[in-house]
């Protein structure tokens, strides 16, 4: 059930073979007769014309597609979890801070799980890009810490209280995704209510050495323009009907009823097409586009 | 596993350093290693911590900025400098580890040791 | 500055009964808060974490819970062994006041 892209929304192809069929027939101007009846309902709505669905078509992340290609063509791989989310990283403005081969890279996330739901796995996913002379066989090792950044009161108000979530060590010999696990601070969101959370990734060399042009470097792909951009997945699972879920789900995928994102409910969670497709289809793969600012 | 060490008897207005020493791991990225006291008899109090990475960012509770100094003296070891040091320091130090800057959820302690300060 | 207020100071019960805490901060902690068990001349030991998350090893009888401001820890078919002070701790925010509540001394009889 492979994903194509999204040219044409369902209603406007839907209108265009209205036409087509009416047209066809003799002796009456159907065109001018649907353009009235449109006119006329649009009116009782309280429209002017027929609402573009452009803000809905946004690109969903190249491993967002992976992940609905993988489980709609082996089954097998689909986690336990019924919902998957994406979050993008919604700082586009501030620029990674290096110095003694320590560089930082700050995100922002916006992050929002019904509290109804479990959540069953969550990763940070980060594009590595490894750059480095093609004339050494070595690849690239560092150090990468994810920090959640906190608040500081009082006298420490300059500070920033910053909590460890995950470290690791990257052998890198190409640019690739990594994927870190923050299952707990995910819930740990969810459950305090919060929404917007600021996170800071580190890399450093492994040996604690400044870092020189034979060593290569190793970076962060932060840039809002790619597929690149750094992505939070949370799989989580909605116990409110989880058989009659299920039933559905697999149903839609052995049958490939759902070849476009849009009645996935990819487009966005909290806008309105996306939501009523996945309240009416139960879905099992949301993304997230929007930004929920709140504290 | 932690340990402590260079506690004893001072002087008030003296000075003294405390030394933690990890065996069987060596400090690196990922965690920070912190200061907390316990006078006889009271409860926990925060000091500082510091930054187990290349950065070797340090963090201090606001009474004892100035005062207390952490620093990473080797890939094993960290120190506190405590300086000016009245009865109300009194208190057993403890080593401890943890992935919060702010000292918060220490799941590695050392035993402690004891300073005195008394003339 | 954010002040944690830890109640009872103490608390006696006997074997096999149940034991509640509980710590008040007086701002919203987000559930960054973690409890520590403390026995005579030992050092202080992790049981939870983020509120309701057992530390490795803890036994399941130890429970936390709460958000916002409120928080608790429970104890449940107590044993001579869950003598202890127990101490609560924010981590949300680099904090000039303490960090760490006063502490609740509970007593198995």
């Known amino acids: 059930s492979p994903i194509m892209n999204l040219e044409q929304s369902p209603l406007e192809e839907d209108m265009s073979l209205f036409g087509d069929v009416f047209s066809e027939q003799d002796g009456v101007d159907f065109n001018t007769l649907l353009q009235s009846m449109k006119d006329e309902f649009l009116k009782t709505l309280n429209l002017s014309d027929i609402p573009t669905q452009d803000s809905a078509k946004v690109d969903p992340p190249e491993y967002m597609l992976e992940l609905y290609n993988k489980f709609a063509t082996d089954r097998t791989s689909m986690p336990s979890a019924n919902i998957i989310r994406s979050f993008k990283n919604e700082d586009l403005f501030s620029q990674p801070v290096s110095f003694n081969g320590l560089r930082k890279y700050p995100l922002l996330f916006n992050v929002s799980i019904p509290h109804h739901e479990e959540v069953i796995m969550a990763e940070l996913r980060l594009y590595t890009l490894v750059q480095r002379d093609r004339m050494i066989y070595d690849g690239v090792d560092r150090k990468i810490t994810i920090f959640e950044v906190l608040e500081s009161k009082g006298d420490n108000e300059g500070e920033r209280n910053m909590l460890v979530l995950v470290s690791g060590e990257i052998y890198g010999t190409n640019s690739e995704w990594e994927t870190f696990d923050v299952t707990d601070a995910i819930r740990r969101w969810q459950k305090s209510g919060s929404s917007t959370h600021q996170l800071e990734v580190h890399i450093e060399s492994k040996h604690d050495e400044a870092e020189d042009a034979s060593s290569g470097r190793l970076e962060i792909d932060t840039s809002a323009q790619n597929k690149h951009n750094p992505l939070l997945i949370v799989f989580s699972d909605d116990q409110s009907s989880d058989k009659e879920r299920k039933e559905e789900l697999n149903e839609m995928i052995s049958h490939e009823q759902l070849p476009e994102l849009d009645n996935l409910g990819l487009d966005s969670f909290s806008s309105g097409p996306g939501e009523e497709a996945l309240l009416q289809m139960r879905s099992n793969i949301i993304y997230d586009s929007t930004a929920r600012i709140r504290r | 596993s932690l340990e402590e060490s260079g506690g004893g008897l001072v002087q008030p207005e003296g000075s003294l350093t405390l030394t933690c020493i990890a065996s069987?791991?060596?400090?690196?990225?990922?965690?920070?290693m912190c200061w907390v006291r316990q006078a006889p008899g009271k409860g926990l109090e925060w000091i500082a911590c510091i930054y187990a990475g290349s950065s070797g960012t340090t963090y201090y509770a606001s009474w004892a900025k100035g005062r207390f100094t952490i620093s990473k003296a080797s890939s094993t070891t960290v120190t506190l400098l405590m300086t000016s040091l009245t009865a109300a320091d009194t208190a057993t130090y403890f080593c401890a580890r943890g992935p919060g800057a702010s000292g918060y959820r220490l799941g590695l302690w050392g035993p402690g040791t004891l300073v005195t300060v008394s003339s | 500055d954010v002040v944690m207020t830890q109640t009872p100071a103490s608390v006696s019960e006997p074997v096999g009964g149940t034991v509640t805490i509980k710590c008040q901060a007086s701002e919203d902690i987000y559930r960054l808060l973690a409890w520590y068990q403390q026995k005579p001349g030992q050092p202080p030991k992790l049981l939870i974490y983020?509120?309701?998350d057992l530390a490795s090893g803890v036994p399941s009888r130890l429970s936390g819970s709460g958000s916002g401001t409120e928080y608790t820890l429970s104890i449940s078919d107590l044993e001579c062994a869950d003598a202890a002070t127990y101490y609560c701790?924010?981590?949300?925010?680099?904090?000039?006041?303490?960090?760490f509540g006063g502490g609740t001394e509970v007593v198995v009889k």
């Open positions: 069987a791991f060596s400090f690196s990225s990922g965690y920070y």
């Open positions: 701790q924010q981590g949300y925010y680099i904090s000039g006041g303490d960090s």
């Open positions: 983020d509120a309701s």
